[in-house]
């Protein structure tokens, strides 16, 4: 905190300029007028300021808009962004993606953090859902974005936007996550043909019930074994073999380096052992020939 | 990506020394660069400033006419010649780089030890 001082005569500043970087911060203080600095914030990023002398700056901002700044100012405030606390970022509404923009760019390289996290959560709370130009600019600055949401915050995701999702935006998504997306997914990407529609739909693919699997198998559609690791566990065990061949195509001989890893192991204990024989492939851990399978939980649902 | 000041040392009054900034990982020509210094106990203070393109220059009252800045962007490097050294211009000496409208990166050196006694 800077005590208050009069300006010493003839320092007064009569604009932003790179003369202030030799004001101590006092005079800055006392010499440099709040709504002068509003006006003129483009020309603070210019200006090689010490972050000591920064910090007076943010106080006269502080001081003029102690209920938060206008976005006049916001989208000018470049480096003097990575000052505001999460606190000061609620106090804002941010509504042009210009802006946006502008202050994503000053975080740029660096790891989201909490100010940019409350920044895009005040943005997006603002529009009242991630559209696809907001989802395409968060995405390219932090490719992670989508899966920092939780399932409730994803389910206010227009199908849409789903157009504006690279695979790498999916890679740290969770399986919950997936589930809200997927549907999303095939909504969006629906009046495709299969081979284009399955390169779409391929990083969604985690979130897909048991159905549109065996449907993917009619397909030729040769899912790797990267994708195939990525389904959920519960849609992949009612598949037969003759499915998981289909959906594999030349792939399939990848299930024997992943027998002891799920989906695949938990897959292959519910199939029959002479059932997978026939891919030739070693697999073992099968239903002995000659067992009985029952479905308690069929026998339940009867009961 | 770094600033890296050099040229600094022990110099008796009246001496002269150059400090150089040089500019690692990225290049100078788009930046503005200030040098500051900062004396034990006291509060860092602006000593010189040049524009991106080297055509304005600006100094603090304490050291006008002594000091001169100036840039040589093909090697990446800023330059502060100090002349007739006085004990108050003891500190420690930094540069900072300043990106300009639509460039908000900023760096900051660690400083080299300037002592004149």
């Known amino acids: 905190e800077v005590e208050k001082t009069a300006c010493p005569s003839g320092k007064k500043a009569r604009e932003i300029d790179e003369s202030l970087i030799f004001y101590k911060k006092w005079e800055l203080e006392a010499c440099v007028d709040a709504a002068l600095l509003a006006t003129q914030m483009d020309r603070v990023n210019a200006i090689p300021f010490t972050y000591e002398q920064l910090d007076v700056l943010k106080h006269k901002l502080d001081e003029l808009y102690p209920q938060g700044y206008p976005e006049s100012v916001i989208q000018h405030l470049g480096y003097l962004f990575l000052k505001m606390s999460p606190e000061d970022i609620r106090k804002w509404n941010v509504t042009s993606l210009e802006t946006l923009k502008a202050l994503l760019e000053v975080n740029k390289g660096h790891e989201m953090s909490p100010q940019v996290a409350t920044l895009i959560d005040r943005f997006v709370k603002g529009r009242g859902q991630l559209d696809k130009d907001t989802l395409d600019t968060l995405t390219a600055f932090y490719p992670g974005y989508l899966c920092s949401l939780s399932p409730e915050e994803l389910s206010s995701v227009p199908p849409s936007s789903i157009w504006a999702v690279r695979p790498q935006d999916l890679d740290t998504c969770d399986p919950r996550q997936l589930d809200v997306l997927y549907p999303k997914a095939r909504l969006a990407f629906q009046n495709m043909n299969g081979s284009e529609y399955f390169v779409k739909i391929q990083s969604f693919l985690g979130g897909a019930p048991t159905e549109d699997l065996k449907a993917l198998s009619q397909q030729n559609v040769s899912m790797d074994l990267a994708t195939f690791m990525k389904l959920r566990t519960d849609a992949v065990l009612p598949l037969t073999v003759a499915e998981v061949q289909k959906l594999l195509g030349p792939h399939v001989e990848g299930l024997k380096a992943e027998e002891r890893h799920r989906p695949v192991r938990d897959w292959i204990l519910r199939q029959r052992q002479d059932d997978l024989d026939t891919l030739g492939l070693g697999l073992q851990g099968g239903i002995p020939n000659g067992y009985l399978v029952l479905d308690l939980s069929m026998q339940e649902a009867l009961s | 990506l770094q600033l890296v000041e050099s040229g600094g040392g022990l110099v008796q009054p009246g001496g002269s020394l150059r400090l150089s900034c040089a500019a690692s990982?990225?290049?100078?020509?788009?930046?503005?660069i200030g040098w500051f210094r900062q004396a034990p106990g006291k509060e860092r203070e602006g000593v010189s400033y040049?524009?991106?393109?080297?055509?304005?220059?600006n100094y603090a009252d304490s050291v006008k006419g002594r000091f001169t800045i100036s840039r040589d962007n093909a090697k990446n490097t800023v330059y502060l010649q100090m002349n007739s050294l006085k004990p108050e211009d003891t500190g420690v000496y930094s540069c900072?780089?300043?990106?300009?409208?639509?460039?908000?990166?900023?760096?900051w050196g660690q400083g080299t030890s300037v002592t004149v006694s």
């Open positions: 900072a780089a300043a990106g300009g409208y639509g460039n908000t990166s900023r760096y």
């Open positions: 990982g990225f290049t100078l020509d788009y930046y503005a």
């Open positions: 040049i524009s991106s393109s080297g055509g304005s220059t």
